[in-house]
Amino acid sequence: LRHVVYWNSSNPRLLRGDAVVELGLNDYLDIVCPHYEGPGPPEGPETFALYMVDWPGYESCQAEGPRAYKRWVCSLPFGHVQFSEKIQRFTPFSLGFEFLPGETYYYISVPTPESSGQCLRLQVSVCCKERKSESAHPVGSPGES
């Protein structure tokens, strides 16, 4: 399953900070960056960096410290940009983010200095069961996989 989130300040739930998405293992979270066909809003286009943070970072909407991970940058408002996060237990050699069932993960965006964007927030709740078994074993494995 794929869950698409249009990440821009026209999304009231992201703006209020009460957006919660529940995903299962092996699902995908698709983040769609702001996109403008024409010149964009008079105050200028939204550009920002998205971070995975801990609860204090989510509450204060601050991406600082060792538990704030920069995930993606929405910096091309006149192009179609989308990022995907696979909700997985393993990534090969742990070279990717690994999600634990029953845990909640917090995403925020921090506007770039020249941007008109605001702080947007999303909670991702990882459910306990796999929606589908892609294989009897994860591909790869060292912690990974």
């Epitope: 991970y69 920069k70 995930r71 993606w72 090969p92 050699f93 983010f97 591909v139 494995s141 990974e144």
Partner: antibody
């Protein structure tokens, strides 16, 4: 700093079982997979399996499915591997290994940490 | 299981000279996520192994830049621009793309 402490050696009789330990310190034990690797004298490396201390989910190499059982004790941050029905083929050094994730910009980097290994000798 | 074949088995090199080790896999190591999960390990005498290179060509923290990893698909190479005494030991390639992860048989590097 991250440390994985393993006993130096175990001497066991053929047909018996042995439970090897790997005590973790210096990081959050329940956040990262713990792997076990076998190295026979003068030979290469074999991956046995992995366990996640968060909920004890395990994945085994089929070649070791009936030989090894992986468990953890979260309270003492210790991973265990029990080897059963031991034969001379099981005489080897066994390593525990974990990968501690950090992040560089948008990229996850995982540094490997190895225990010193436990030398298991199966002999009557 | 994916078979990893390393050559040569033993490599005798003079200090300061270049050297290279080859690793071939029985299947492509390109993962469906677009990455190639091929590592190189070094096991110095009497020590535990330690990873030197990950994702084919990325040097681990603290690894000197005289080491270079390259390759794609099924063919991979570890090169030393100039050998130093501390480089002696056994080198292993290690794949994590396919389950279960597997290792090459090792290449023993000795000083001539």
């Amino acid at each position: 700093q991250v440390q994985l402490q393993q006993p130096g050696a175990e001497l066991v009789r053929p047909g018996a079982s042995v439970k090897l330990s790997c005590k973790a310190s210096g990081y959050t034990f329940t956040r990262d997979w713990m792997h076990w690797i076998k190295q026979r004298p003068g030979q290469g490396l074999d991956w046995i399996g992995t366990i996640h201390p968060y909920d004890s989910e395990t994945h085994y190499n089929q070649n070791f499915k009936d030989k090894a059982t992986l468990t953890v004790d979260k309270s003492s941050s210790t991973a265990y591997m029990q080897l059963s029905s031991l034969t001379s083929e099981d005489s080897a050094v066994y390593y525990c290994v974990t990968f501690i994730k950090t992040m560089v910009d948008t990229y996850y980097y995982a540094m490997d940490y190895w225990g010193q290994g436990t030398s298991v000798t199966v002999s009557s | 299981d994916v078979v990893m074949t390393q050559t040569p088995l033993t490599l005798s090199v003079t200090i300061g000279q270049p050297a290279s080790i080859s690793c071939k896999s029985s299947q492509s190591l390109l993962h469906s996520d677009g990455k190639t999960y091929l590592n190189w390990l070094l096991q110095r005498p009497g020590q535990s192994p330690k990873r030197l290179i990950y994702l084919v060509s990325n040097l681990d923290s603290g690894v000197p830049d005289r080491f270079t990893g390259s390759g794609s698909g099924t063919d991979f190479t570890l090169k030393f621009s100039r050998l130093e005494a501390e480089d002696l030991g056994v080198y292993y390639c290690w794949q994590g793309t396919h389950f279960p992860q597997t290792f090459g048989g090792g290449t023993k590097l000795e000083i001539k």
